[in-house]
């Protein structure tokens, strides 16, 4: 089942999505979209990373986060009631299915009053429960293309309210991560 | 300490084609991705690409694709950008830059630069 | 493209003064903003990356600031040496770009 997250019209929402990189520079691509993930790829992409960038997003939709660390939490500027949904994060690890998938669920709400300018940063976000999944075992490690060798070790999400960018970061370096390597 | 020494300076004509190298020395050479970084006469920086030796990835400002094609040759830590179909206007200095992990691939190494002139 | 735009593309100072350069991108970048110094003849020289982050070596004057759209780099205590041409440069997505430059002069 999904975790919720909610934000209200006019306000930025955050979805938040963490792994953390083998070795500096061995980063994982990673894809964002609209609907729940599919069995491959994303459906309807609204963004992706390779090994070193963002190499694709469409307007409203970007990563505020460190993303060349592992935090490649999704944030979506000035929703609309048509941005509720499901998002899938995947994490693209290489091998054969090999891939992290986590379906997140977006509720916007009507604006109580009329919304004041936010800041980039600003969201508002509810985590209703934890979710933790684990990894059985290294995955099978493989070389495709110009991406790294990583293996999979430690899967794990969290789900918890995030106030602002620093307790995401102190989040994620409390273990809330997916870990390759 | 690290250091990129880059070939020297080149004149071109017009349709032809120019490889800078790169030796780079005092670091892992495949641990860091190669960018390569351009200034015409009196103007800006214009980035062309990068290649990760590692791996042999690379990739490419579209502006230039087709037309840049970027190499490393592991064994001498070197690196090469090459410039086909020259123009008038890629006159400028050629830098090759070291995008570090750390520093978030922004460049904490550049070489001294090669002047290119293309001119008939 | 993300395009980096710094406005101002003379700056005059005087030695002493404190000196803000500003940099403002096409769409957020996060974070993922360096600050270069290139002097006459010289290849640039990395300052900030990440934004904020003082690159080794760098005089503690130089300070970078802001997130998303908008960039400061401050120089808080000019100095003759610190006549020069400071870049901005996105490095959030490729093609990595780079502001058109501002160049510091005395008064």
């Known amino acids: 089942s999904e975790v919720e997250y909610r934000a209200e019209v006019g306000q930025n929402a955050y979805l938040p999505c963490f792994y953390t990189p083998a070795a500096p520079g061995n980063l994982v691509p990673v894809c964002w979209g609209k609907g729940a993930c599919p069995v491959f790829e994303c459906g309807n992409v609204v963004l992706r990373t390779d090994e070193r960038d963002v190499n694709y997003w469409t307007s409203r939709y970007w990563l505020n986060g460190d993303f060349r660390k592992g935090d490649v939490s999704l944030t979506i500027e000035n929703v609309t009631l048509a941005d509720s949904g499901i998002y899938c994060c995947r994490i693209q690890i290489p091998g054969i299915m090999n891939d992290e998938k986590f379906n997140l669920k977006l509720v916007i709400k009507p604006a109580k009053v009329t919304p004041a300018p936010t800041r980039q940063r600003d969201f508002t976000a509810a985590f209703p429960r934890m979710l933790t999944t684990r990894g059985h075992g290294p995955a099978e490690t493989q070389t495709l293309g110009s991406l790294p060798d990583i293996n999979l070790t430690q899967i794990s999400t969290l789900a918890n309210e995030l106030r602002d960018s620093r307790l995401a970061n102190d989040l994620r370096d409390s273990g809330a991560t997916i870990r390759i390597g | 300490q690290v250091q990129l020494v880059q070939s020297g300076a080149e004149v071109k004509k017009p349709g032809a084609s120019v490889k800078v190298s790169c030796k780079a020395s005092g670091y892992t050479f495949t641990d860091y991705y190669m960018d390569w970084v351009r200034q015409a006469p009196g103007q800006g920086l214009e980035w062309l690409g990068y290649i990760y030796p590692n791996k042999g990835g690379t990739s490419y400002n579209q502006k230039f694709k087709g037309r840049v094609t970027m190499t490393t040759d592991k064994s001498t830590s070197t690196a090469y950008m090459e410039l086909r179909s020259l123009r008038s206007d890629d006159t400028a200095v050629y830098y090759c830059?070291?995008?570090?992990?750390?520093?978030?691939?922004?460049?904490?190494?550049w070489g001294q630069g090669t002047t290119v002139t293309v001119s008939s | 493209d993300i395009v980096m735009t710094q406005s101002q593309k003379f700056m005059s100072t005087s030695v002493g003064d404190r000196v803000s350069i500003t940099c403002k991108a096409s769409?957020?970048?996060?974070?993922?903003v360096a600050w270069y110094q290139q002097k006459p003849g010289q290849s640039p020289k990395l300052l900030i990356y990440?934004?904020?982050n003082r690159y080794t070596g760098v005089p503690d004057r130089f300070t970078g600031s802001g997130s998303g759209t908008d960039f400061t780099l401050t120089i808080s205590n000019m100095q003759s040496e610190d006549l020069a041409d400071y870049f901005c440069?996105?490095?959030?997505?490729?093609?990595?770009?780079f502001g058109g430059g501002t160049k510091l002069e005395i008064k």
């Open positions: 830059a070291r995008g570090g992990y750390y520093s978030y691939y922004s460049y904490d190494y």
């Open positions: 440069q996105q490095h959030y997505s490729s093609p990595y770009t």
């Open positions: 990440y934004a904020s």
């Open positions: 769409q957020s970048v996060g974070n993922n």
